[in-house]
Interface confidence: medium
């Protein structure tokens, strides 16, 4: 006896009703009463509904079933379920009994819509661009587990720092929770996508952070758009200026310098008077320009340590701030060049060449070359060690084999100062001693 | 109307760089990202990278990120794709494309007319 | 990355004959963009956001999903319709497209 059921699974809502279709081909003269149905669990055997005997023996599976009676003598053995749960999921199995018998298998894949996302946002009182923000993207009582994407504002990938939790309640349906941990620009919008992977239904909200740069009408910042260069043991100015209205006075300002990612104040001016430095005695305001808007920093004694962003926060009756970078340099001293072996050298032999070239910051880049200029890539190795001031000691070593002569040049370049200082040798074709004798 | 519109056709040596310029008229620049396609001949399409002309922010295909630079200058909206160290692979058409939508949804709406480079040595 | 792979590579079909294109991709996408290209002519927006139809474009394209499989239907083409149409997606970085499909009239 052929049994026919649909192929696909049959996807039916959380508290709809459900059809599960089955059929068969009736002979002539057929009647229920040689009709033997039985509708099971696949997996379980467990019995879900019944045609025996000529009569329908009703739902064993919670009292959520029904055959199609008036159907039954055209071989449609369907059965319906209602109010459809999340636990219903899976395979049932159709068997039909005349003389022969035949059977076949449905499934059911339930799904439940995730209901549009609700956006939090967590501080969510005066952020700043550079603050750290958690956004959350809750979709809650869906089915099955949910796929879930970020973007921002271009429509780009936010694939950073997410972390998507998913609990099923006692029903079987899914909250799920989305973090995003992301760093405010000036402004930006975030979005979160919540799919559902049966229904290819996506539900998605979005928030828009814009944050505080200032109320209106408040204080204008203005610091430089480019970092500060300044080098090892020099002073550095930090500009910040604002402009006064008419009738400012220096009792009404408040200026507080800070470094913009540990908060650690640096230097104030507040009540009428200067606070003083609060970091390691080396900043300085420029006090008799105060009143005419200038609001800079003076920091003595650069160090490498100083390197990063202050912040500049002027309050008088409205506020406004800025952060200015500060990047720290120090020159490469000229390098010294030194050859092993360096007695008797002949062409065919390997030489190794070092270039080493001191206290310098930040990190050197190092380039070797022929005396015709062309770059020596070849076997070179570099390294370069940090001592307790932060300054950089950087050693290149250049293995090659001696041409009848030849000049061999390290190039030793700050990429901040864009400073080069380089060194050479020349290695003539005799027999020769490093460094030549007198 | 919005449009890209690209410089001209380039012929260049294995080694050498090249640079495309795009163009952009009639929407506010700085409102979307630039992002640059190249197409070899015959071939499919290949994402090179883009470029926020408000933000100046990019982002590179790591096939091409050691050779690509990619700038905007705001005050001609005028988008630029520098490719160095040139090879024979390289010769395409190379195409930008305006990325517009609304959030969450995002799509190539606008593109330039596209700039042949052809490395032959 | 996340791979697009088209199928077929290359189909020629009558006029009024039913097409379908498939973009399968290597995992999740939160949607997908498709694109018509013809011969020496740059890429034109056909299908944004996984179903919407850009603008000019006939009703007789479809999208539907399955899973990972994104299959574009036309409905019963037309000699305008033949083209190269490729599959964009930028879930996650790079930006990729499928390798394409050219589709012939006979």
């Known amino acids: 006896l052929e049994v026919q059921v649909p192929e696909d699974p049959v996807v039916a809502l959380v508290g709809t009703d459900a059809t599960l279709r089955c059929s068969f081909s009736p002979e002539p003269g057929f009647s229920l009463a040689q009709l033997n149905l039985i509708w099971q669990l696949t997996d379980t055997k467990q019995l879900v509904h019944s045609f025996t005997e000529g009569r329908d023996q009703g739902s064993a599976y919670a009292n959520r079933t029904a055959l199609f009676l008036d159907l039954l003598a055209q071989g449609n053995a369907s059965l319906r379920l209602q109010r459809v749960r999340v636990a219903d999921e899976g395979s049932f199995t159709c068997f039909v009994s005349i003389r022969d018998f035949g059977s076949a298998a449905v499934s059911l894949q339930v799904a439940a819509p995730y209901s549009k996302p609700s956006m939090t946002l967590e501080p969510n009182k005066d952020l700043r661009p550079g603050d750290t923000v958690t956004i959350t993207c809750s979709s809650y009582r869906g089915y099955p587990e949910a796929e879930v994407f970020w973007q921002d504002g271009q429509g780009a990938p936010l694939t950073g720092n997410v972390t998507t939790s998913q609990m099923a309640n006692e029903q079987g349906l899914f909250d799920v929770h989305s973090v995003l941990r992301v760093v405010l620009g000036a402004n930006g919008t975030y979005s979160c996508l919540v799919r559902n992977p049966v229904l290819q239904q996506d539900a998605h909200g979005s928030i828009t952070i814009t944050p505080q740069r200032s109320p209106t009408g408040a204080v204008e910042v203005q610091v430089p758009e480019d970092p500060v260069v300044a080098l090892v043991g020099t002073d550095a100015t930090l500009r910040c200026s604002f402009s006064p209205e008419p009738g400012f006075s220096l009792a009404q300002l408040n200026l507080i310098w800070q470094l913009t990612d540990t908060k650690q104040l640096v230097h104030s001016f507040t009540e009428g008077r200067d606070q003083g430095s609060a970091y390691a005695n080396r900043t300085a305001l420029f006090l008799d320009l105060l009143a005419q808007g200038n609001a800079s920093l003076r920091l003595q004694r650069v160090r490498v340590a100083d390197e990063g962003s202050f912040t500049c926060f002027v309050s008088i009756r409205d506020f406004g701030s800025a952060a200015v970078s500060l990047q720290v340099a120090a020159p490469y001293s000229k390098p010294s060049m030194t050859l092993e072996p360096n007695k008797d050298l002949r062409p065919g032999d390997t030489v190794t060449i070092t270039c080493s070239s001191y206290r310098g910051y930040p990190e050197a880049e190092v380039f070797w070359q022929d005396g015709q200029g062309a770059p020596l890539t070849g076997n070179v190795t570099t390294s370069q060690m940090a001592n307790e001031q932060g300054l950089f000691d950087v050693h290149s070593v250049l293995r090659v084999v001696l041409g009848a002569n030849g000049t061999y040049s390290c190039l030793v370049r700050n990429p901040v100062l864009q400073q080069d200082a380089h060194g050479s040798v020349t290695i003539t074709g005799q027999p020769m001693t490093f460094p030549p004798e007198a | 109307e919005v449009q890209l519109v690209q410089s001209g056709a380039e012929v260049k040596k294995p080694g050498s760089s090249v640079k495309v310029s795009c163009k952009a008229s009639?929407?506010?620049?700085?409102?979307?990202?630039i992002h640059w396609v190249r197409q070899a001949p015959g071939q499919g399409l290949e994402w090179i990278g883009y470029?926020?002309?408000?933000?100046?922010?990019?982002d590179y295909n790591q096939k091409f990120k050691d050779r690509t630079t990619l700038t905007a200058d705001r005050s001609t909206s005028t988008a630029y794709m520098e490719l160095s160290s040139l090879r024979s692979e390289d010769t395409a058409v190379y195409y930008c494309?305006?990325?517009?939508?609304?959030?969450?949804?995002?799509?190539?709406?606008?593109w330039g007319q596209g700039t042949t480079v052809t490395v032959s040595s | 990355e996340i791979v697009l792979t088209q199928s077929p590579d290359f189909q020629s079909v009558t006029p009024k004959e039913k097409v379908t294109i498939t973009c399968r991709a290597s995992s999740s996408v939160s949607y997908m963009n498709w694109y018509q290209q013809k011969p020496d002519q740059s890429p034109k927006p056909w299908i944004y956001?996984?179903?919407n139809l850009a603008s000019g474009v006939p009703s007789r394209f479809s999208v539907s999903v399955s899973g990972t499989d994104h299959t574009l239907t036309i409905n019963s083409l037309e000699a305008e319709d033949a083209a190269t149409y490729y599959c964009q997606q930028w879930s996650s970085n790079p930006l990729t497209f499928g390798q394409g499909t050219k589709l012939e009239i006979k």
């Open positions: 009639g929407y506010s620049f700085t409102s979307y990202t």
């Open positions: 470029i926020n002309p408000n933000s100046r922010n990019t």
């Open positions: 494309a305006r990325y517009s939508g609304s959030t969450p949804y995002w799509y190539f709406d606008v």
């Open positions: 956001a996984t179903s």
